[in-house]
């Protein structure tokens, strides 16, 4: 398809040729093209391209362009040739190539497809059935990320209430660029009756740490010392903790934000691997104090999406006073 700009043109290059589109993995869409035929000999060819909504304009010498996009709707790329990197130079007539999502009744596609990366060790995806699906539909989830050679099928399909889901191992690789990438997801049914649904999960978002594990509570004077085990797999700059202390007598509910803290006081079991400690000031030792802790990722490591861990198991210390 040719797309001509409204304005009159001055000395433009011929259009690119053989523009084609293909899909790699699950959601990597690749356009390739050949240089224009009969381009000026004194022209150093550059290619201007943008997506159908005029987004992501790019001027580059390569004869390909790719994008990672969930193929839930049609996406088009327009490409033209020009002789410089100047964005104000008019490119040739733009050639357009589109790719449509797999066919099927849109009402049959699963909805609310989302995934959470649990403790940087496994990914759990869930979805709701589409409106036009039979209750006995057997779903299959496929996934791909850069450290996999091929697309994998998720084996652990489960059902939780209205939601279906599947979980698969996804362990953080030491490679520092691992988390700059995404996991590509597709859900369809075994019989091929429903329209496939796609999602792209950036590995910098939707991260849910495991809950901490409280190891020890102790009093020293009027201070309460709390010691807990941190979730594995995270580096210290990427987590912070919320310590909640409830006092049965005063019915107070104190919340403290805590940086991962070394266990340096003599009251703590010291130098224990992967543990943190915190001193809660001004706690009444002769009353019952109940502590629980949860953890959250730092927005500078993982994009904020309001995901805290579950709360730890509660632990109590002190005596519950008899009500008289």
């Amino acid at each position: 398809d040719y797309k001509d700009d409204d304005e009159s043109r001055t000395e433009t290059q011929p259009p690119v040729t053989n523009l084609s589109v293909s899909v790699e993995n699950l959601c990597t869409v690749i356009w390739t093209w050949n240089p224009p035929e009969g381009a000026s000999s004194n022209c150093s060819l550059w290619y201007f391209s943008h997506f159908g909504d005029k987004q992501d304009k790019k001027i580059a010498p390569e004869t390909r362009r790719s994008i990672e996009v969930p193929l839930n709707e049609r996406i088009c790329l327009q490409v033209g040739s020009q002789c410089s990197t100047n964005e104000s130079e008019k490119p040739s007539i733009l050639v357009e190539k589109c790719i449509s999502p797999p066919e099927g009744d849109p009402e049959s596609a699963v909805t609310e497809l989302q995934c959470i990366w649990h403790n940087l060790s496994y990914m759990k995806c869930s979805w709701l059935p589409g409106r036009n699906t039979s209750p006995d539909t057997n779903y299959t989830l496929y996934y791909w990320h850069r450290s996999l050679e091929k697309i994998h099928q998720c084996e652990n399909i489960f059902r939780e209430g209205q939601y279906f889901g599947c979980s698969f191992d996804l362990t953080k690789v030491k490679d520092s660029s691992f988390e700059q990438h995404s996991v590509q997801i597709m859900v369809k049914d075994n019989a091929g009756k429903i329209k496939p649904s796609f999602n792209i999960v950036p590995l910098t978002s939707r991260v849910k740490p495991d809950p901490p594990h409280i190891k020890n509570l102790s009093f020293h004077n009027d201070d309460l010392y709390v010691q807990w085990e941190n979730p594995q797999n995270f580096i210290s700059r990427c987590l912070f903790y919320e310590v909640e202390v409830n006092n049965s007598q005063t019915e107070t509910h104190n919340v403290f934000y805590v940086q991962e803290a070394k266990c340096e006081n003599p009251e703590f079991e010291r130098n224990v691997e992967n543990t943190s400690c915190f001193m809660v000031p001004g706690v009444l030792p002769d009353t019952l104090n109940t502590v629980r802790i949860r953890v959250k990722t730092n927005k500078l490591c993982y994009e904020d999406d309001k995901l805290w861990s579950n709360w730890s198991q509660e632990m109590s210390i002190g005596k519950k006073r008899n009500s008289t």
């Epitope: 700059r237 919340v255 934000y257 940086q259 070394k262």
Partner: antibody, heavy 118, light 104 residues
Framework: EVQLVQSGAEVKKPGESLKISCKGS????????IGWVRQMPGKGLEWMGV????????RYSPSFQGQVTISADKSISTAYLQWSSLKASDTAMYYC???????????WGQGTLVTVSS | EIVLTQSPGTLSLSPGERATLSCRAS???????LAWYQQKPGQAPRLLIY???SRATGIPDRFSGSGSGTDFTLTISRLEPEDFAVYYC?????FGQGTKVEIK
């Protein structure tokens, strides 16, 4: 007591380079981020960037990326903010501040006034 | 990029009155990351509130923070003479433009 002590005021000419410092004490310097905040005369606060001295991981605000460099020397508990070529528009008060992982600045340096004028 | 908009720009009140300062985010943010600061002329800012509602160490209880999603509030229940200053909200890389609380 947590303290952040910044280097003294500087007067520079456009095109010159500069490195200002911020020394932390009274806490584990490698366990908290150090951030830099700019305040131009009569204006508000601008988040420039942060460094985690434990592993020297840095993050810059898009507005300051490529304009300044943030570094740290954990052996002397000191963070730095530097320019390779100052401009008159860099004239401002620069604050360093300690940042826990939840992103607020809980302790601040006294500020370093940088004046760039020909 | 998230934008924090503070209102009003200036608040003219008398000592003993209640001050209510607003901070609105351009998109929903986690309350864990919302902080409030006070800055007096010639001084460095001072942290008042973190996590939207937790008072920083040494901050009097007349200062309180509340809110979630896109709307956050700093309340000073009874203004003391030393509370007249500029107040900023912040969420990681973004500060609001400030609200000046001045004596009426």
């Amino acid at each position: 007591e947590v303290q952040l002590v910044q280097s003294g005021a500087e007067v520079k000419k456009p095109g010159e380079s500069l490195k200002i410092s911020c020394k932390g004490s009274g806490y584990s310097f490698t366990s908290y981020w150090i951030g830099w905040v700019r305040q131009m005369p009569g204006k508000g606060l601008e988040w420039m960037g942060v460094i985690y001295p434990g592993d020297s991981y840095t993050r810059y605000s898009p507005s300051f990326q490529g304009q300044v460099t943030i570094s740290a020397d954990k052996s002397i508990s000191t963070a730095y903010l530097q320019w390779s070529s100052l401009k008159a528009s860099d004239t401002a008060m620069y604050y360093c501040a300690r940042m826990p992982n939840w992103g607020s600045f809980d302790h601040w340096g006294q500020g370093t006034l940088v004046t760039v004028s020909s | 990029e998230i934008v924090l908009t503070q209102s009003p720009g200036t608040l003219s009140l008398s000592p003993g009155e209640r001050a209510t300062l607003s901070c609105r985010a351009s998109q929903s943010i986690s309350s864990s990351y919302l902080a409030w600061y006070q800055q007096k002329p010639g001084q460095a800012p001072r942290l008042l509130i973190y996590g939207a509602s937790s008072r920083a160490t040494g901050i009097p209880d007349r200062f309180s923070g509340s809110g979630s999603g896109t709307d956050f509030t700093l309340t000073i229940s009874r203004l003391e003479p030393e509370d007249f200053a500029v107040y900023y909200c912040q969420q990681y890389e973004t500060f609001g433009q400030g609200t000046k609380v001045e004596i009426k």
